[in-house]
Structure formats: structure tokens, C-alpha cells
């Protein structure tokens, strides 16, 4: 791969636009952030391929990393790939933004790691503080990476100058996960039910194979012993398995269920707990919020999705006008609920490019024998905007009249505009907005109806022109939330027996 | 320097609406979750709701569910409670705060607190 | 729902104190909990997180402890500054509860 500039670093100004070439033997692609951004490719008549990649109008944000790679690294030999690092110095641009995965480090292990707090200017001095802290840290700085090496569990913040203003950076948390040299898993064949049902718990050991299990729960505490019983899970070496069963559970057994596991060879000792939830009855509750009017595009699929809790599993229903969905053999509608955790539940209602008659009144349902919830809203097909007509007429009175009708959802907007020098427009020219209560050559009038069975509205706009007295290119654009549709037409003096 | 400045608050009627702003500078807004907390005269802290970095997830106390909504604005660093139906429990001291909220860890999460706050706009629901 | 209880609801006490308040949450919560101090008229301030971590700028008089239902915020030496309203709070994936509140106030 050939880069061009080769780089490996650039500086360049900001508002600039910069040009940036890579040519190979085979398909090769830029890449930034791990998209592709718009370039130009081409194949050269000597068989190389290239890649131009066209910054406009630079600004901070785009200092970073920028990778040239084959576009297909199948049947190549090496997956090459040239990183270039472009810095854009822009003093209204201080620490580059992070996302959350960036802001939060979490570590299994005492490793070096980097907190990337990275500036637009490899000039500037650039240092790293505890958050709420003075004392720079003595910690070293790569402008492209941020800083490396071995931190504690704290926040840590980042500062620089940028002309006579101290800038900080976001805070990093650096969060070390205590990992145990006893591998120990609890898990309950449910951990939310109801009384009178049975609790069974799990407690695994792996690696280890003499260890003691003891388990304290909430009838512990009370003198009421259960007797776990441990077993090997033979098809796997040293898989101890501990049970613990609580038949007819009674309210009280509601609580914390702990495993510890000790190891007296090496004195090793873990424990693991989960909690458990005896309830009187069955719930279902909504999590989240979903908004009592909803949207979706013409032709264009949707999908709504409701959140919620239950125990037992409950029975999903969706209504449409208070009709019962079900999945449709056609592929217009698909329903489904899914399981994300032991209790929470996604249900899915997905309409398969959207038809005008899918608008309506949707509920869901979900209940069991205990317990019921239900959630509804509207939904409104939004349809793009077209213009259906567009006419000029002279009636007697002398003036000149253009008649626009166009319909969509939501309501369209009208825009009139006009271009005298028919030449030059529009390229040159920009067209002249019409209809404004200022103008006293035209005159506006405009009339919306809303059509119910094709739930969408149609607009008539008439504009009246009092004198025209060379040709003129008028323009009808009908605008709402989900596009826009332009005509023109082109209205010639009376005294003019043609139109151009 | 991180900072939250709430706006929007004032006196409403019972039934009302009211849309109260909280915008957010010194930090990167569209990396937290963010959080609406209120303080009724003379009484404890009641968490309102809150809504994760691109506005996909939302929660919010029970006693506010279909009345109250919280949205964002991530270009404009701002967050938002639109106050529908209001009534004269709601009157509170309304503090928005960005809410420390990491990334899951496999099937742990983790909560590192309400690290910074607003000073708070007070809304009056009275006829 | 997960209620949590904060005793006591009202604490006198001198600067140089040494003060505990108590925060117990009526089912197992681990360790997610959270302590805030706020002075009167103010946002409050956050001083704890996962029921033991001291966040940063906030003096090392302030510790927390506890697990499961039963937590506790400490100052070690109680100073001018600290008198105020504590309050603890619990938070999951979906939800946030704070207790109702420890006014700490000079004897």
C-alpha cells in the first residue's frame, strides 16, 4: 500500500481541505473510526487501485487515526493496513470527546493501560491529575494516545492550556475487578417465585478438587436446616457442585443465599451470593416509557418495542383497534417477545414496509393468572410530500394565476419562488421567495383538506400574479417532516404567443 | 469547568404543563446518563427518572409515568422534563445531575454515583 | 420496590464527633448504594459510591461500610462544614431510591 501523504503524522489547519491518496495492487478503502468514510475509488489502466479520501472544512474533531487497508484481505498475502495520524489544531476544540467505554477502565489484573485524553495540538503541554487534584502526575504522554502506564482505582482527569484558557478533560474511572483464585458460580433455577413453589440453588467450583461448601440462607438464621447435597459433574475434571433445594417456599425465604467455598491446601477461600424473591403472587410491570403517539414512514419498516417485568411468564396479545394481531402469513406484520433476563421481557410489533391503513390505535397485553398490564398508543403513518399538479391559467381579469395541489402527513408546507432570467436560474441566481404579505405583485391563497381514508392532507395554493411582463420560471415546493417534492412551470406574458 | 444550570421553572396550574431545561457544559454530554432528581418544600430527595447516552433508554418513578417526559438533546448539550398534567404534589425544587452509569460488565453493573449537580429551578403547583 | 430506612431522622452533635448514621434497605442490595450530604439551599454532593468508595475531593473523615441490607456513613471528626443532611440511595438498573434523610445538627 502506498499512502500519500506518506505521513505517518500531519498537521493541518483548520477550515482547510486536504487530500488524502492510497493505492494498491488490490480494492483498497480508508477507514476512520471503523466506518468508511465517502471516498473516491478507481482502477487505474496499469491495474492499481486507488482511494481518495477528500477532508473539507477541517475542524478539531477530525484529529485522529485515519487506516488505508484492502478493501478484500481475502487471498492477500499480509493484511496490510498504513495508519496515518492527522492533527487538526483548533482552539475551540479542547480534549477530543470520548465515549463511555473510553471514560470507564475497568482491569482484571494489574496491567498498563492508556487513558486517552487526546488534544487537536501536538504542541500543546498536556498533563494528568487525580480529578479534584493539583499535583500532575508523573506519568508520560503520547499526543496520539493519551497517557500510559500503571494507575490505581481512582479518577483521573486531564489539563492543558490552550492560549490563556486551562482546560480539563472528562474524568476516567479506573475500576479493578477482584478477581478470586477460587472459581466459584452461584446460580438458582429461578430466583424470582412465588410461595409454595420450590427454590433450587447451584454453587460450582472449577479447578479445585477437595473444598468445602457452606451455604447461609434466611431459614439458616431461623434454625430451620436444609441439607445441600454435592455431587461431581463427572463429564468435566474437577466440577464440584453443591444443591440446595427448598421445597414449598414460604415469603421468609425471600433474601440473600450465599455460597462460600473454602480450599485448605493453599487456604484459598471464595463465596458467591444471589438473591432471591419469594412473592405472593405473579406480577407484570412496564419498564421504560413509550410515548402515546407514535410514528412510522410510508413504505419504510417500524418497529415498536415494550419493555417489562413478569413472573410467571405471561401470555403477550397485540391489539390494532381492538382487532388481535398475529403474525401475517403475507410478512406485513411480525410479532415476538423475548426473554432478556429471567423476569424482564421485549416485546415486538415490526410492520413490514408500512401501508396507510396501519394506522391506528395498537395495544399490548400481558398478563397470567395473576396479574395483567396493558400499554397502548397511536400510530400515525407519516407519507412524503408530492406534488400532484401544477397549472397556469389567464383568466379574464388580466392576471396570471399558477394553481399548486400536493398532498402528504404530516401537513405539507407550501413554498412559492420565482426566477426572472431564465438563464441564469437557478444555478446563478437564487430564486425569489413569492407570496409574502409584502409583495404587492402576488397574491397568495391557500386551502388544506384532510382526506380520512387516506389519512393524509392535500393542499391547494393559488398564487396570483398581477403583471408579468417577461417569461418567468415559478416553482411550487411542498415540504413536511419526511421530505419534499419541487415542480416548476414557466408563465410567459399575455402578449407572447408561446411558451418556452 | 462541569457544570449544570436547570431553567424553565415557575408557577403552573393544576393540569398544567411546564418543560423544564438543563443545559450542560465541561464535560461530554452525549457519553453520560443523565438524571432528574426533586425536593418537595421541606422534604427528603425523590429520584424523578433518567435516560441513558443516545436517549434509547428512559425510567422513571412510578408516580410520574405517563405524565412526565425526559428527552435529550445531544447537540445541544441540553436535557429536558416535559411536566404534563401536573399536580400539586409535584411542587419540588427540580435538580438535574449526571448520573455515573459504566458500561456493563458482562452480567455486572456497576454505579459510580450522582457526581455532578445543577442548583436546581423550583416549580409551584398552585391554582 | 426496595424501600430504604435512615436512622436516625435527626443527629445532634459537637464539631470533633465522631458520627455514624445508619441506612438499612428492606431486601439484599449488595453493595450499590450511595451517600450525599446537602447543605441548606444547595444541590446535593455526592460522597460515596458502591457503599464504601470515597469519591474524589471529598475529605477522608467520610467512610462507608456495609453490605447486603445494613450500611453505615462515618465521620470520623465531625467539623463545622459537616452539618447537613445526609441522605443514602440506592440504585439498580432501572431505578434510583434515596432514604429519607439525617439531619445532623449542632448540640
Known amino acids: 500500500l502506498v499512502v500519500t501523504p506518506p505521513g505517518p503524522e500531519l498537521v493541518l489547519n483548520v477550515s482547510s481541505t486536504f487530500v488524502l491518496t492510497c493505492s494498491g495492487s488490490a480494492p483498497v478503502v480508508w477507514e476512520r473510526m471503523s466506518q468508511e468514510p465517502p471516498q473516491e475509488m478507481a482502477k487505474a489502466q496499469d491495474g492499481t487501485f486507488s482511494s481518495v479520501l477528500t477532508l473539507t472544512n477541517l475542524t478539531g474533531l477530525d484529529t485522529g487515526e485515519y487506516f488505508c487497508t484492502h478493501n478484500d484481505s481475502r487471498g492477500l498475502e499480509t493484511d496490510e493496513r498504513k495508519r496515518l495520524y492527522i492533527f487538526v489544531p483548533d482552539p475551540t476544540v479542547g480534549f477530543l470527546p470520548n465515549d463511555a467505554e473510553e471514560l470507564f477502565i475497568f482491569l482484571t489484573e494489574i496491567t498498563e493501560i492508556t487513558i486517552p485524553c487526546r488534544v487537536t495540538d501536538p504542541q500543546l503541554v498536556v498533563t494528568l491529575h487525580e480529578k479534584k487534584g493539583d499535583v500532575a502526575l508523573p506519568v508520560p504522554y503520547d499526543h496520539q494516545r493519551g497517557f500510559s502506564g500503571i494507575f490505581e482505582d481512582r479518577s483521573y482527569i486531564c489539563k492543558t492550556t490552550i492560549g490563556d484558557r486551562e482546560v480539563d478533560s472528562d474524568a476516567y474511572y479506573v475500576y479493578r475487578l477482584q478477581v478470586s483464585s477460587i472459581n466459584v458460580s452461584v446460580n438458582a433455577v429461578q430466583t424470582v417465585v412465588r410461595q409454595g413453589e420450590n427454590i433450587t440453588l447451584m454453587c460450582i467450583v472449577i479447578g479445585n478438587e477437595v473444598v468445602n461448601f457452606e451455604w447461609t440462607y434466611p431459614r439458616k438464621e431461623s434454625g430451620r436446616l436444609v441439607e445441600p447435597v454435592t455431587d461431581f459433574l463427572l463429564d468435566m475434571p474437577y466440577h464440584i457442585r453443591s444443591i440446595l433445594h427448598i421445597p414449598s417456599a414460604e415469603l421468609e425465604d425471600s433474601g440473600t443465599y450465599t455460597c462460600n467455598v473454602t480450599e485448605s491446601v493453599n487456604d484459598h477461600q471464595d463465596e458467591k451470593a444471589i438473591n432471591i424473591t419469594v412473592v405472593e403472587s405473579g406480577y407484570v410491570r412496564l419498564l421504560g416509557e413509550v410515548g402515546t403517539l407514535q410514528f412510522a414512514e410510508l413504505h419504510r419498516s417500524r418497529t415498536l418495542q415494550v419493555v417489562f417485568e413478569a413472573y410467571p411468564p405471561p401470555t403477550v396479545l397485540w391489539f390494532k383497534d381492538n382487532r388481535t394481531l398475529g403474525d401475517s402469513s403475507a410478512g406485513e406484520i411480525a410479532l415476538s417477545t423475548r426473554n432478556v433476563s429471567e423476569t424482564r421481557y421485549v416485546s415486538e410489533l415490526t410492520l413490514v414496509r408500512v401501508k396507510v391503513a396501519e394506522a391506528g390505535h395498537y395495544t399490548m397485553r400481558a398478563f397470567h393468572e395473576d396479574a395483567e398490564v396493558q400499554l397502548s398508543f397511536q400510530l400515525q403513518i407519516n407519507v412524503p410530500v408530492r406534488v400532484l399538479e401544477l397549472s397556469e391559467s389567464h383568466p379574464d381579469s388580466g392576471e396570471q394565476t399558477v394553481r399548486c395541489r400536493g398532498r402528504g402527513m404530516p401537513q405539507p408546507n407550501i413554498i412559492w419562488s420565482a426566477c426572472r432570467d431564465l438563464k441564469r436560474c437557478p444555478r446563478e441566481l437564487p430564486p425569489t421567495l413569492l407570496g409574502n404579505s409584502s409583495e404587492e405583485e402576488s397574491q397568495l391563497e391557500t386551502n388544506v383538506t384532510y382526506w380520512e381514508e387516506e389519512q393524509e392532507f392535500e393542499v391547494v395554493s393559488t398564487l396570483r400574479l398581477q403583471h408579468v411582463d417577461r417569461p418567468l420560471s415559478v416553482r411550487c415546493t411542498l415540504r413536511n417532516a419526511v421530505g419534499q417534492d419541487t415542480q416548476e412551470v414557466i408563465v410567459v406574458p399575455h402578449s407572447l404567443p408561446f411558451k418556452v | 469547568e462541569v457544570q449544570l444550570v436547570e431553567s424553565g421553572g415557575g408557577l403552573v396550574q393544576p393540569g398544567g404543563s411546564l418543560r423544564l431545561s438543563c443545559g450542560a457544559s465541561g464535560f461530554t454530554f452525549s457519553s453520560y446518563w443523565m438524571t432528574w432528581v426533586r425536593q418537595a418544600p421541606g422534604k427528603g430527595l425523590e429520584w424523578v427518572g433518567n435516560?441513558?447516552?443516545?436517549?434509547?433508554?428512559?425510567y422513571s418513578v412510578d408516580s410520574v409515568k405517563g405524565r412526565f417526559t425526559i428527552s435529550r438533546d445531544n447537540a445541544k448539550n441540553s436535557l429536558y422534563l416535559q411536566m404534563n398534567r401536573v399536580r400539586a404534589e409535584d411542587t419540588a425544587v427540580y435538580y438535574c445531575?449526571?448520573?455515573?452509569?459504566?458500561?456493563?460488565?458482562?452480567?455486572?453493573?456497576?454505579?459510580?454515583?450522582?457526581?455532578?449537580w445543577g442548583l436546581g429551578t423550583t416549580v409551584t403547583v398552585s391554582s | 420496590d426496595i424501600q430504604m430506612t435512615q436512622s436516625p431522622s435527626t443527629l445532634s452533635a459537637s464539631v470533633g464527633d465522631r458520627v455514624i448514621i445508619t441506612c438499612r434497605a428492606s431486601?439484599?442490595?449488595?453493595?450499590?448504594l450511595a451517600w450525599y450530604q446537602q447543605q441548606p439551599g444547595k444541590a446535593p454532593k455526592l460522597l460515596i459510591y458502591?457503599?464504601?468508595s470515597l469519591e474524589s475531593g471529598v475529605p477522608s473523615r467520610f467512610s462507608g461500610s456495609g453490605s447486603g441490607t445494613e450500611f453505615t456513613l462515618t465521620i470520623g471528626s465531625l467539623q463545622p462544614d459537616d452539618f447537613a443532611t445526609y441522605y443514602c440511595?440506592?440504585?439498580?438498573?432501572?431505578?434510583?431510591?434515596f432514604g429519607q434523610g439525617t439531619k445532623v445538627d449542632i448540640k
Open positions: 440511595q440506592h440504585y439498580n438498573s432501572y431505578s434510583r431510591t
Open positions: 445531575s449526571r448520573d455515573l452509569v459504566p458500561p456493563r460488565q458482562g452480567d455486572n453493573y456497576y454505579y459510580f454515583g450522582m457526581d455532578v
Open positions: 458502591e457503599a464504601s
Open positions: 431486601q439484599n442490595i449488595n453493595n450499590w
Open positions: 435516560i441513558n447516552q443516545d436517549g434509547s433508554e428512559k
